[in-house]
């Protein structure tokens, strides 16, 4: 039975041209994490593998930075970066846990961070 939950940075906003950290935390399980995938809608942004380290998709190479931790830093944000982001935790023996983050990139200086929330 999958007992874990993923806590994410939730709904967040950031300014155009700035950067933002996407973070997820897997809790309430003793399952071993073997890999974390970061995706934007259907596109793979990055993979962090327990044995192989980081792989950043070539198309995002200049705007995505690995870390901190298993998180992902998005840089030089544009309005087109607005949308859903997913952290996908591959674990053994539980299987896959997915967390969702919604990022809104704003033109003005009214960006604020949303509250954390949990996804079972």
């Amino acid at each position: 039975m999958m007992t874990g939950t993923i806590e994410t940075t939730g709904n967040i906003s950031a300014e155009k041209g700035g950067s933002i950290i996407l973070q997820c935390h897997l809790s309430s399980t003793t399952a071993q994490v073997t890999q974390v995938n970061w995706e934007q809608q259907d596109q793979l942004l990055a993979i962090c593998n327990a044995d192989l380290g980081w792989h950043i998709s070539p198309s995002f190479k200049d705007r995505v930075a690995p870390g901190p931790g298993l998180g992902l830093t998005l840089q030089s944000l544009t309005v087109n970066d607005t949308g859903e982001y997913f952290c996908i935790y591959h674990t053994y023996p539980d299987g896959t846990y997915t967390g969702r983050i919604f990022l809104e990139v704003l033109e003005s200086s009214v960006a604020e961070h949303g509250a954390r929330f949990q996804i079972p």
């Epitope: 973070q23 897997l26 994490v33 192989l52 380290g53 980081w54 200049d62 690995p66 901190p68 931790g69």
Partner: antibody, heavy 117, light 107 residues
Framework: QAYLQQSGAELVRSGASVKMSCKAS????????MHWVKQTPGQGLEWIGY????????NYNQKFKGKATLTADTSSNTAYMQISSLTSEDSAVYFC??????????WGQGTTLTVSS | DIVMTQSQKFMSTSVGDRVSVTCKAS??????VAWYQQKPGQSPKVLIY???YRYSGVPDRFTGSGSGTDFTLTISNVQSEDLAEYFC?????????FGAGTKLELK
């Protein structure tokens, strides 16, 4: 097995600059962040910043911006840190540390920097 | 910057004892906390990552717990080789920050 070999101790005059190295072996250099950490008896462990050799991207602690410059040479699997305008405050042990799936799982042995006036 | 507070600079213990080293973050860091052990003249070694996961090869007498702002490293059945300094670190946001360290000494 990953291994980080740092350059030897440095004794440098105040006002000068120094460049220390961290040679990585036993893993894919371009798949892990390389962090640099300063250790002094007074301030403990302080994070300076990191470089991701996969694309040369860097991220600095604001405190060390303009003081430290991080670079990497993927042909020799070596990360470098240059520290400029040296003062006695820069005397410390400097560590490089690998970070990927696990935080700071491999560290260099440290480079001792002594700044003399 | 997130401040990681290790309120005890020194802790006295005896071989066979159980000891708990605590660390408090100035804001929520989730479970992005690691614990390191450092012996004199050596570089730090990671013991615990993600607050509670033991790193490969670390003896099971080392246990990490906590989330949010309060974290604990527990060493059960302390051995003489455990006498060292222990640091917590948050890696939830930049700049990454460390606690000031807790030195474990013999009574």
């Amino acid at each position: 097995q990953a291994y980080l070999q740092q350059s030897g101790a440095e004794l440098v005059r105040s006002g000068a600059s120094v460049k220390m190295s961290c040679k990585a072996s036993g893993y894919t250099f371009t798949s892990y962040n390389m962090h640099w950490v300063k250790q002094t008896p007074g301030q403990g462990l302080e994070w300076i910043g990191y470089i991701y050799p996969g694309n040369g991207g860097t991220n600095y602690n604001q405190k060390f911006k303009g003081k430290a410059t991080l670079t990497a040479d993927t042909s020799s699997n070596t990360a470098y840190m240059q520290i400029s305008s040296l003062t006695s405050e820069d005397s410390a042990v400097y560590f490089c540390a690998r970070d990927g799936f696990y935080p700071f799982d491999y560290w260099g042995q440290g480079t001792t920097l002594t700044v003399s006036s | 910057d997130i401040v990681m507070t290790q309120s005890q600079k020194f802790m006295s213990t005896s071989v066979g004892d159980r000891v708990s080293v605590t660390c408090k973050a100035s804001q929520n860091v989730g479970t992005n906390v690691a614990w390191y052990q450092q012996k004199p003249g050596q570089s730090p070694k990671v013991l615990i990552y993600s607050a509670s996961y033991r790193y490969s090869g670390v003896p099971d007498r080392f246990t990490g717990s906590g989330s949010g702002t309060d974290f604990t490293l527990t060493i059960s059945n302390v051995q003489s080789e455990d006498l060292a300094e222990y640091f917590c670190q948050q890696y939830n946001s930049y700049p990454l920050t460390f606690g000031a360290g807790t030195k474990l000494e013999l009574k």
